[in-house]
């Protein structure tokens, strides 16, 4: 089966490398604007200029296209914790990311929030905290892992998974009941 | 079949608390980011909040940020959402989604908070 292809790349594969057919003269290839720029009008014929402009300010186009348009640069989510790593520029879109001692949670694949890397306090650090990991901790005796924080035993209700881990210090909160009881 | 089935809401004073509760089945609760919508009357949908499968992590919207709370049981496949300090403005229909990839995938029928004296 011969994979489908879009109408865009039918006449672009018509065309050598960084040239695109002109949508009205499918005999005439017209260069590919460079980055930074967008189509402003198409070539008048063979070998001759494709009307290229400069992305405004708040614009940009990443990579040699035809579009009619730039494209609109990202907003860094606030809300989301993100701060600007590095400002849209006519050829490259700003750039978002999380602060020092953060990591990203991705809600999608192109939304993310930012969280605070565990600290791993009552145990020790087993991985360190990454650009899209959080810090993997090992708990101390006595504690047990919760949402990645490391809780007292003395908070593990017999219902919760943390019995197994917990389970001499359950059993000794238990003997001591017994032993007042005698 | 996905049901979603929330229950808490009421007519409350400004200042009040509610506690809404989502009960969840049909559906793996502990692999889904769960989330809480609403609309107020005559408004478009807003995120409230929504929060991760396994609970860690949680987002607020910024007109609720400091007064509410969400969490999730998976052991009982209920989602819950703590409301306090509540303001004529919270009033609206809250619905409880399951988060797929930010689009919600199933919505329960609502329950309606009304903040009023």
């Known amino acids: 089966l011969v994979p489908h292809l879009g109408d865009r790349e039918k006449r672009d594969s018509v065309c050598p490398q960084g040239k695109y057919i002109h949508p009205q003269n499918n005999s005439i290839c017209c260069t590919k604007c460079h980055k930074g720029t967008y189509l402003y009008n198409d070539c008048p014929g063979p070998g001759q200029d494709t009307d290229c402009r400069e992305c405004e300010s708040g614009s940009f186009t990443a990579s040699e296209n035809h579009l009619r348009h730039c494209l609109s640069c990202s907003k860094c989510r606030k809300e989301m914790g993100q701060v600007e790593i590095s400002s849209c520029t006519v050829d490259r879109d700003t750039v978002c990311g999380c602060r020092k001692n953060q990591y990203r949670h991705y809600w999608s694949e192109n939304l993310f929030q930012c969280f605070n890397c565990s600290l791993c306090l009552n145990g020790t650090v087993h991985l360190s905290c990454q650009e899209k990991q959080n810090t993997v901790c090992t708990c101390h005796a006595g504690f047990f892992l919760r949402e990645n924080e490391c809780v007292s035993c003395s908070n593990c209700k017999k219902s919760l998974e943390c019995t197994k881990l917990c389970l001499p210090q359950i059993e000794n909160v238990k003997g001591t009941e017994d032993s007042g009881t005698t | 079949e996905v049901q979603l089935l929330e229950s808490g809401g009421g007519l409350v004073q400004p200042g009040g608390s509610l506690r809404l509760s989502c009960a969840a089945s049909?559906?793996?609760?502990?692999?889904?980011?769960m989330g809480w919508v609403r609309q107020a009357p005559g408004k478009g949908l807003e995120w409230v909040s929504f929060?991760?499968?396994?609970?860690?992590?949680?987002y607020y919207a910024d007109s609720v940020k400091g007064r509410f709370t969400i969490s999730r049981d998976n052991s009982k496949n209920t989602l819950y959402l703590q409301m306090n300090s509540l303001r004529a403005e919270d009033t609206a229909v809250y619905y409880c989604?399951?988060?797929?990839?930010?689009?919600?995938?199933?919505w329960g029928q609502g329950t309606l908070v009304t903040v009023s004296s």
């Open positions: 049909g559906f793996t609760f502990t692999e889904y980011n």
């Open positions: 989604a399951e988060l797929n990839n930010l689009m919600f995938d199933y």
């Open positions: 929060i991760g499968h396994s609970g860690q992590h949680t």
